[in-house]
């Protein structure tokens, strides 16, 4: 990346397009949810970051490469009743027009006497939307990063059984630091309450249907969680995520 | 429904200081990158300054650099423009534009607020 | 800087004409251009984006075409309520950088 633009804009918290390349680790982690190489274990001989292309390349549908993106599914299709099954997704109510990959299948509603296949480890993601407001909308989400990841997705729950969905207040960045200096002209100690600016949600993926139907199924959730950095470089996410992260063993400390 | 609007506008003499205010709704704030657009009568548009209200991060035009300081309060969903040293050529209808794109700079402006006018003038 | 030049300056057409406005980029910004309409004393209004994708609700005849340095707007059947002024915009780099605008007046 020889670009003094470039080097100057990156990890800066923006996303620039003309620093968002493998070269420039995508500006930094700042295009790629600040994971600065989502192909650092693909093994690949291809560039597959540069393969993404509507087409199928082989040499990179592994798991290590993001399954190529998924371009190597020989029926590629898009759910028939997505509105319906969007609405209807997760409910508990086996809906069998929604039972299919592309529908998400109905969000193991068709599946509940089946045993759970667990991918091993912990996606965290921080959202910048408020915990209340990402619950009540946590089937909608569930389904755009199951479709994504082409699987399922579900909120992991701590000892007590309650929802890991924790909120967030940013991180303590001289930048960030500054920002609150500004705006609100009080001493740090003085500031009452935090401001909560978005979630912290701790996800599992159960590929219970996803083995039944494909063999691109994430082992883990390295993998899953470098396919949606992968989404953040194409623009193609639906949320306004800021981070994701792998855990393997269970996160010790939630928060 | 999302909608931008904008206050803080009028006369000011050259050398003075002024400040712009843009309360946001409809969305959320913190997610969506803002920019100041502005206009001198009867020309076009001239972007002005840039920020990511979520990290604090901010992008300035040359002419505008070390005079003008964008920032945002995410408690009141409202960015600003703070701006120092004005010239007679800072004279424009300025407009605060929200990015498509979450804390991407390179998307493009969808919502644009009404606009307020900033005469710079002895 | 990324320079955008846009041609014509401004145009006459009337009610039902094909009017197609170009824009020059001094390099290449791939896609990321987008297309405004502006009306007198109105704030400018997105009507393309990534070259040839329409915002939501703009009419069908409103196309973008282009990539890398030459983009083109097209209208396909000008509407009495088309009378405005156009302008592109890159935003693969910053400064982001408009074009002049191109006025489209009533023949």
């Known amino acids: 990346c020889q670009s003094q633009y470039c080097a100057d804009k990156a990890r800066d918290g923006i996303c620039d397009e003309a620093c968002n390349s493998h070269a420039c680790q995508w500006d930094g982690g700042d295009c790629s949810l600040t994971m600065e190489d989502p192909w650092a274990n693909c093994t690949s001989t291809l560039r597959c970051w540069e393969y993404i292309n509507n087409q199928c390349d082989e040499q990179c549908n592994t798991a290590e490469c993001l399954f190529d993106n998924f371009e190597c599914q020989r029926n590629s299709k898009t759910c028939k009743y997505d509105k319906y099954c969007a609405d209807h997704f997760k409910d508990n109510h086996c809906d069998q027009g929604c039972n299919s990959e592309e529908c998400g299948w109905d969000g193991l509603d068709c599946a509940s006497d089946q045993p759970e296949n667990l991918a091993e480890g912990t996606l965290i993601i921080v959202v910048l939307l408020p915990p209340e407001q990402l619950l009540q909308d946590s089937r909608s989400f569930l389904r755009a990063l199951g479709t994504l990841l082409h699987t399922n997705l579900r909120i992991k729950q701590d000892s007590q059984g309650a929802l890991m969905v924790y909120p967030y207040f940013g991180e303590k960045s001289a930048a960030m630091k500054k920002q609150k200096m500004t705006r609100r002209s009080l001493p740090e100690e003085q500031e009452q309450e935090q401001e909560v600016i978005g979630s912290k949600i701790f996800l599992e993926i159960d590929n219970r249907q996803c083995v039944q139907d494909s063999d691109q199924c994430f082992k883990n959730t390295d993998a899953a969680a470098a396919l949606l950095a992968s989404h953040a470089i194409q623009g193609t996410l639906s949320y306004p995520l800021v981070s994701v992260f792998s855990e393997l063993e269970s996160p010790r400390n939630a928060q | 429904e999302v909608q931008l609007v904008e206050s803080g506008g009028g006369l000011v003499q050259p050398g003075g200081s002024l400040r712009l205010s843009c309360a946001a709704s409809?969305?959320?704030?913190?997610?969506?990158?803002m920019s100041w657009v502005r206009q001198a009568p009867g020309k076009g548009l001239e972007w002005v300054s840039y920020?990511?209200?979520?990290?604090?991060?901010?992008y300035y035009a040359d002419s505008v650099k070390g005079r003008f300081t964008i920032s945002a309060d995410t408690s009141k969903n409202t960015a600003y423009l703070q701006m120092n040293s004005l010239r007679a050529e800072d004279t424009a209808v300025y407009y605060c534009?929200?990015?498509?794109?979450?804390?991407?700079?390179?998307?493009?402006?969808?919502?644009w607020g009404q606009g307020t006018l900033v005469t710079v003038s002895s | 800087d990324i320079q955008m030049t846009q041609s014509p300056s401004s145009l006459s057409a009337s009610v039902g004409d094909r009017v197609t406005i170009t824009c020059r980029a001094s390099?290449?910004?791939?896609?990321?251009l987008a297309w405004y309409q502006q009306k007198p004393g109105k704030a400018p209004k997105l009507l393309i984006y990534?070259?040839?994708s329409r915002a939501s609700g703009v009419p069908s005849r409103f196309s973008g075409s282009g990539s890398g340095t030459d983009f083109t707007l097209t209208i396909s059947s000008l509407q009495p309520e088309d009378f405005a002024t156009y302008y592109c915009?890159?935003?693969?780099?910053?400064?982001?950088?408009f074009g002049q605008g191109t006025k489209v007046e009533i023949k």
């Open positions: 409809g969305y959320t704030f913190s997610s969506y990158g």
């Open positions: 990534g070259a040839s």
């Open positions: 390099q290449s910004n791939r896609r990321f």
């Open positions: 534009a929200r990015h498509s794109g979450y804390y991407r700079i390179s998307s493009a402006m969808d919502v």
């Open positions: 920020i990511y209200p979520y990290s604090g991060a901010t």
């Open positions: 915009q890159q935003y693969y780099i910053s400064p982001l950088t």
